[in-house]
């Protein structure tokens, strides 16, 4: 293959790969017809002048996961055909000016996971054809004005995981073709009005895991093509009324892990494509009427781990397509009988870890397709007659960890549960709390005659005594639609940002946590 260095492997497809700790300099001679060169996991500490001079046909060059800390300005001379250059995962602190000069075909430049302290306009001024620039995982504290002014064709810019404390409103102004901008995991406290105004083709904006406290009202008003907006894990305490008004293409919005105290009606301006809204881990205390009424296509609404104590009867108006509603781990004591009436397509509802002491008899009246109801860890003493009668698809009902009062009033519920045991799961059953003489005994098998009779015995029909069996032959908990462990956050669809964390039973969507925010 026109000579392959002993430390490398060379394939017929003009691909050369050089790996191993024994390599301390760029191997020579490299085959002149190489089109792809990878130098990975070596002990190379510096690149001297023109080590690639004889391989001018090179299209892709990956120099990753080395000890590289110094590069001579002329290191990449004669690589005019190079389209892809990665220097990721090295130890670069400084980029020499003119390093990328002559790389007229360069489209992707990856400088991520180094120790870069600064970038200057002169660094990229020659890279007019660049489409992708990855700078995440460095030590950048600021971006000077003009740094990206020559990169008019750039479509993807990643500045995540740096130490940026502020952004100049002019720094992105010439990036009219930019589609993806990532600024996650920095130290941004606010973003000046106008910062994103020039980004008319932006589709994804990742601002999660900063320290942003306030959003300017018109911050996103020029970003009509925005599809994904990540604002989770910041310090946002309020949302200006018009902040999301001009985002008709938005299909993902994350706001979990902020300090939101309230949501005003119509705050989520027309977003016909939004399917999921993640609002867990905020400080929301109440939900007013029509707060989500513009989200006609919403299918998943996560409001868990807030401080919600009041939900207005019309709070969920407009959510006719909603499939999953998570309200667990809040401070709900009461629910209006009509609060879920509009949710005709609801399948899963989690209400566990609240303070519910009773439920209205009509609470699930119009929600005929419910498949999973989580009511564990509340303060329920009984449930109204026939509350689950019409829920023919119900296959998961969690009622444990409530202070069930096992007097004669509990008989209708006991009888229904007896005939519908598969729905309760096998791991944890509801037990009586009072009277004291039956405390701790299973509600399903309790002999109510032992318990203290209540003052009145209702003379109304009992729960239906039709046994229920699931359609499937087996009934493992793990296949249920909404298990008691829930998906904590959306898995965001870019791999350089996603981190997987497993949490305990305080998780949010009541499966494992794939949290990338």
């Amino acid at each position: 293959y026109h000579g392959c260095p002993s430390e490398c492997t060379c394939s017929r497809a003009s691909q050369v790969e050089c790996t191993g700790a024994r390599i301390v300099a760029v191997p020579t001679p490299l085959p002149w017809n190489a089109m792809s060169l990878q130098i990975l996991n070596t002990h190379i500490t510096e690149l001297n002048e023109s080590p690639f001079l004889n391989i001018s046909a090179l299209i892709a060059l990956r120099i990753e996961k080395n000890e590289l800390s110094r590069i001579t300005p002329g290191a990449f001379r004669n690589l005019g055909s190079l389209r892809y250059l990665s220097l990721a995962n090295n130890k670069l602190q400084v980029l020499p000016i003119g390093l990328f000069q002559g790389l007229d075909s360069l489209e992707s430049l990856l400088l991520s996971s180094n120790q870069l302290l600064q970038i200057q306009p002169a660094h990229f001024s020659q890279c007019s054809n660049l489409k992708e620039l990855q700078l995440h995982g460095n030590h950048l504290e600021y971006i000077p004005d003009g740094a990206f002014d020559h990169l008019v064709g750039l479509t993807k810019l990643n500045l995540g995981k740096n130490s940026l404390t502020h952004i100049s409103p002019r720094v992105f102004q010439h990036l009219g073709n930019l589609q993806v901008l990532r600024l996650y995991e920095n130290r941004l406290t606010d973003i000046p009005m106008g910062t994103f105004d020039g980004l008319v083709n932006l589709q994804e904006l990742a601002l999660q895991q900063n320290q942003i406290g306030l959003l300017s009202p018109g911050l996103f008003h020029n970003n009509h093509n925005l599809q994904r907006l990540y604002l989770s894990n910041n310090h946002i305490s309020q949302l200006p009324p018009s902040v999301f008004m001009q985002l008709p293409q938005l299909n993902r919005l994350t706001l979990f892990g902020n300090s939101l105290k309230e949501l005003s009606p119509g705050i989520f301006g027309p977003m016909p494509n939004l399917r999921e809204l993640w609002l867990y881990d905020n400080h929301i205390s109440s939900l007013p009427d029509n707060v989500f009424s513009n989200l006609r296509q919403l299918q998943v609404l996560i409001l868990s781990r807030n401080q919600i104590s009041f939900i207005s009867p019309g709070a969920f108006n407009g959510l006719t397509e909603l499939r999953e509603l998570s309200l667990h781990t809040n401070a709900l004591q009461d629910l209006d009988g009509n609060v879920f009436r509009m949710l005709a397509n609801l399948q899963n509802i989690s209400l566990q870890n609240n303070r519910l002491r009773q439920l209205p008899g009509n609470i699930f009246a119009n929600v005929n397709g419910l498949m999973a109801i989580q009511l564990q860890n509340n303060q329920l003493e009984n449930l109204p007659l026939g509350i689950f009668d019409h829920l023919g698809k119900l296959c998961e009902l969690r009622l444990y960890d409530n202070p069930w009062r096992c007097d004669s009033d509990i008989l209708p519920l006991r009888n229904w549960l007896l005939l519908n045991q598969p729905r309760l799961g096998t791991d944890t059953v509801p037990v009586c709390f009072s009277p004291a003489n039956v405390r701790g005994q299973s509600l399903i098998i309790i002999n109510v005659n032992v318990a203290v009779p209540s003052v009145h015995v209702p003379e109304v029909p009992s729960y239906p005594e039709t046994p229920w069996y699931p359609d499937t032959p087996s009934y493992p908990d793990t296949t249920s639609v909404s298990s008691t462990t829930e998906l904590t956050s959306p898995v965001e669809d870019y791999t350089d940002l996603t981190t997987i964390q497993v949490t305990d039973d305080r998780s949010v969507w009541g499966m494992t946590q794939a949290q990338s925010g």
């Epitope: 564990q376 303060q379 059953v429 039973d505």
Partner: antibody
Amino acid sequence: EVQLVESGGGLVQPGGSLRLSCAVSGFSLTSYGVHWVRQATGKGLEWLGVIWAGGSTNYNSALMSRLTISKENAKSSVYLQMNSLRAGDTAMYYCATHMITEDYYGMDYWGQGTTVTVSS
Amino acid sequence: DIVMTQSPDSLAVSLGERATINCKSSQSLLNSRTRKHYLAWYQQKPGQSPKLLIYWASTRESGVPDRFSGSGSGTDFTLTISSLQAEDVAVYYCKQSYNLPTFGGGTKVEIK
């Protein structure tokens, strides 16, 4: 006879963690919830959290990020794990349950407590 | 979180006299549907673990002497010891369980 016995206290370095145990007898953890409460010397009572019969947990919101309550029903033991300890966590730690009271969050049986000192 | 404020911090009363302890919550402890106030009183004698005296603002726990009584509504509650006995020397705590429990700061009762 109903009994709750705390153990695992002692001297802990700041920034360290502790794991306290509460061994119960006379009742089953599959039937009763167990609370953890602490009291600094000469100070008031502070509710830390509870694990219910079915395994659900509730926590004091101010301490939630540092606390985990768990249990092993077969061993009749409840555990309190607390991380990132500081001097202010020095206290007597009690476990308690609701044996007879009609108050769901009432605590009518208490252990004698175990002392935790956080100091370098 | 609901904040519970007790007054006074300490109280010296003669044997046989009435002792009154006040507890104020930062929000109402009444659940309108159950019509219960979720407030309890605990007694802690020196060197001992706490003991539950009263729950639901006014329901005495079994075995508690009838000289102990609880009253109040909304946000204001009172524990009364109608005739103080020597064995009543203790610190008394109120506790709300309307939301997740919080205790008051305690009131120390001594003999004058």
